[in-house]
């Protein structure tokens, strides 16, 4: 018998070193995967049993010949994948019976030449992949054929020229995609694209196109249906007004010019592309943008300038420059990405004219933006900006009123900087619609009572690892944030807080408080008693208190937190938990108590929270394997549907001595049965 796996109507026989077709698969399979084997042929008679096949994938084998009768035997075959084989010849007969094929993949074979008309009968073919074959011509037949073809992939061949007579077989086709990437193209002969019925997308990445050849290409695309043109990874070192001029009689909407080592964007380079909506200039070497660089892009919606500019070298003169008003023509631009650049700073009119801009990403963009002032973003005053990403810019100070121009801003990301200051609250002045402020991973933030007084709309506040100080002031810095749903105060080594820290945050759903030092606050011996900072958080869903050194949980600290779905108390020093502390957590879905010092798991503590649990993590606790300590737990484990990962390996007895290292779940509770308190 074979080792194929069969699921529903799909048989997977891949990676089995097969040298012949299995003959004992179910006869009703519709998909057969034979990839990565040692097949040399696909004998038609071996497929007689599998006449329902719709998809046959025989990629990554050593097939050197295809018998025409295969498709006769498989009348319903729609997808035939023969990529990475050893086919060198395909004749008029090879696919003659494959009239119902919709997809044919012949990528990575050794088909150097297409003789006569092997695809003449493929009137249903919508995708044909002949990439990586050593073809020197695009000619796949004489006379019009492949009238339903939508994707023709000819990348990584040896095509030197595009000639009209070699593309006329596509005269009735509407190609959604023609991929000629990674071909050493040197010539676009007159009318070469006019012979194709319709061409919507052309990919010519990595095709060694220089500016002159690009200009010639664009003229040949004139008066075609082209909408998407990808010219990434060529050697388009400079563009001028003439480079794309041939595209003025098209409705081009997408243009990819990434990875071109583009240095000089000449004035008016895009002036003939009024329909363009998407432009990528990622990973280039642009020295300067001037006020006319983007002239004519009156409909552009998306512009990526990620790593588009010159990299900084020793000479300061090499800093790229964005002149004032460089973006002034882009009145419909909604998304601008300028990540990973070496721009010195913003100027007073850097972003002027971007009156539709909603998303602006400036991560690792600037070299001299240490201080944000109320002038930094003045050029965005007329932009309806919703999201601003300022991560990784070495920002150390935010001045009052910095964001006062951004009244519609919803998300502000200032994470991964070097901000060290006292937050007076005036930094956020004018952010009347703000939804999220991300400040995590900064140097030092000192809070005051008014730190967030001006942003009552805030729903998410992230303050992870910012060496947070003054958290214990009263009234609480968070008191104005009545709409807050997520608060992250983790990794701050917080040791002192007041009971009213979160008072009034009735909408809080997620509280991240892990990696702090709250142990003293929950001790019975704490002067003034334990600090119950969770009271009133009636809508709290997720609570993370991992790694806080906790060795006690006060009674009543989780009282009335009925909506809690997840509690993480892992990596603490908890040992004996008080009865009834989780009584209100009957809706709990996830409980993490891993790496504590828990020895016993008793019903009066864990009964309520275990009722509806999906996931429990109590690994690496020193369980005491006695009836009193764990019989209830073991019985529960053995009848629950809760997911308990690594139960066999990481739930081990620690005591008594003779049970040391013994898997908890194998503990025999039958001798405990007569102890009434431990019954299920």
């Amino acid at each position: 018998t074979n080792q194929c796996t069969v699921r529903y109507n799909v048989a997977d026989c891949s990676h089995l070193k097969l040298t012949h077709i299995p003959d004992d698969l179910p006869s009703n399979i519709t998909v057969l995967n034979l990839t990565h084997n040692q097949l040399r042929r696909l004998p038609p008679t071996n497929f007689t049993r599998y006449s329902q096949l719709a998809i046959l994938d025989a990629g990554f084998n050593s097939i050197s010949k295809l018998e025409p009768e295969l498709c006769q035997i498989l009348p319903l075959l729609k997808v035939l994948n023969l990529q990475h084989n050893e086919l060198s010849q395909i004749s008029d007969q090879t696919f003659v019976f494959c009239t119902n094929l919709t997809e044919l993949d012949l990528m990575s074979n050794s088909i150097h030449k297409i003789k006569s008309n092997p695809f003449k009968n493929q009137k249903n073919l919508i995708k044909l992949d002949l990439s990586h074959n050593g073809l020197s011509s695009t000619k796949l037949g004489t006379g019009v054929q492949l009238e339903n073809l939508q994707e023709l992939l000819l990348a990584k061949n040896k095509i030197l020229a595009l000639r009209s007579e070699e593309l006329e077989f596509l005269g009735n086709s509407s190609l959604r995609k023609l991929d000629l990437s990674s071909n050493p193209l040197k010539e676009f002969s007159p009318g070469c694209f006019q012979t194709i019925g319709k061409l919507f997308a052309l990919l010519l990445n990595n095709a060694q196109l220089n500016p002159h050849l690009t200009e010639k290409l664009c003229w040949e695309l004139s008066n075609t249906s082209i909408q998407n043109l990808s010219l990434a990874n060529n050697q388009l070192l400079a563009t001028s007004e003439s480079t794309f001029s041939g595209l003025k009689w098209t409705n081009l909407t997408q243009l990819d010019l990434s990875y071109n080592n583009l240095h000089d964007v000449g004035n008016g380079s895009f002036s003939y592309l009024p329909s363009l909506r998407y432009l990528s200039l990622e990973y280039n070497n642009i020295q300067r943008l001037s006020p006319r660089s983007f002239y004519g892009l009156s409909n552009l919606r998306y512009l990526s300038l990620k790593r588009a500019f010159t990299k900084q070298s020793v000479s300061l003169a090499s800093h790229p420059n964005i002149d004032d008003f460089s973006f002034q023509w882009l009145k419909y631009l909604e998304y601008l990405n300028m990540d990973d650049n070496n721009i010195p700073s913003t100027k007073s009119n850097t972003f002027t004219g971007l009156v539709s801009l909603k998303y602006l990403s400036l991560s690792k963009t600037f070299t001299s933006l240490q201080t944000l002032t109320n002038e930094t973003f003045v050029s965005l005053a007329h932009s309806p900006l919703l999201t601003l990403n300022l991560t990784k810019n070495h920002i150390s100070k935010i001045a009052n009123g910095t964001f006062s121009w951004l009244g519609q801003l919803r998300i502000l990301d200032l994470g991964l900087n070097e901000i060290e200051q006292k937050l007076s609250g005036q930094e956020w002045r004018g952010l009347r619609n703000i939804f999220e402020i991300y400040l995590s991973y900064n140097k030092y933030l000192q809070l005051s009572t008014s730190s967030f007084a001006l942003v009552p709309s805030l729903q998410r506040l992230m303050l992870r690892r910012v060496a947070l100080k003054n958290v214990d002031i009263s009234p609480s810095p968070f008191r104005p944030l009545r709409n807050l749903t997520i608060l992250d105060l983790s990794n701050n080594n917080i040791a002192n807080i007041n009971e009213d820290l979160l008072e009034g945050l009735e909408n809080l759903e997620i509280l991240d408080f892990q990696h702090n030092n709250l142990a003293r606050l929950w001790k019975r011996a704490n002067p003034g008693g334990p600090v119950n900072f969770l009271k009133g958080l009636s809508h709290l869903h997720i609570l993370n208190l991992e790694s806080n050194g906790l060795d006690e949980i006060p009674v009543g600290v989780f009282k009335n937190l009925f909506e809690l779905k997840s509690i993480n108390l892992g990596l603490n020093n908890l040992n004996k938990l008080e009865p009834f502390i989780f009584d209100d957590q009957t809706s709990l879905r996830s409980l993490n108590l891993q790496k504590n010092l828990i020895t016993s798991v008793e019903k009066d503590v864990f009964g309520p929270p275990f009722q509806n649990l999906n996931s429990l993590d109590m690994r690496f606790n020193p369980f005491d394997c006695t009836c009193e300590s764990i019989s209830w737990f073991v019985n529960w484990i053995n009848q629950t549907h809760t997911n308990i990962s690594e139960l066999s390996t990481h739930y081990l007895c620690n005591t008594p001595h003779h049970y040391y290292g013994f898997p908890l779940k194998l503990f025999d509770t039958s001798s405990c049965k007569d102890s009434a308190p431990f019954e299920l």
Epitope: I55, D57, N100, E103, N124, I126
Partner: nanobody, 115 residues
Framework: EVQLVESGGGLVQAGGSLRLSCVAS????????TGWYRQAPGKQRDLVAE???????IYADSVKGRSTISRDNAKNTVYLQMNSMKPEDTAVYFC?????????WGQGTQVTVSS
């Protein structure tokens, strides 16, 4: 990802007619081969009819001459019109599209022909 939803099944008298519909989301029918299959209790799933990008159609011998498969690309819908129905046409009818090298199936619609 293509989602297929069949409708139009139900109880029909022998000799009656029925029109099944299959709506696709995620990929228009104009770019794939679309078929109707059926599965009677305890039997394997069999082809009823199929329509190709070219408009070509194929039918199982058992329904030839009394069934028509058609499609409306604008509505992303393929239809199966069945006439002169027989008790042996009772089955769950499934819609099928093969696209991007994947075999997509609907949940099926029950057709019962009573004599």
């Amino acid at each position: 990802e293509v989602q297929l939803v069949e409708s139009g099944g139900g109880l029909v008298q022998a000799g009656g007619s029925l029109r099944l519909s299959c709506v696709a989301s995620g990929s228009p029918f104009s770019i794939g081969a679309t078929g109707w299959y059926r599965q009677a209790p305890g039997k394997q799933r069999d082809l009823v009819a199929e329509i190709y990008p070219s408009g070509d159609t194929i039918y199982a011998d058992s329904v030839k001459g009394r069934s028509t498969i058609s499609r409306d690309n604008a509505k992303n819908t393929v239809y199966l019109q069945m006439n002169s129905m027989k008790p042996e046409d009772t089955a769950v009818y499934f819609c099928n599209v093969v696209r991007w090298g994947v075999d997509y199936w609907g949940q099926g619609t029950q057709v019962t022909v009573s004599s």
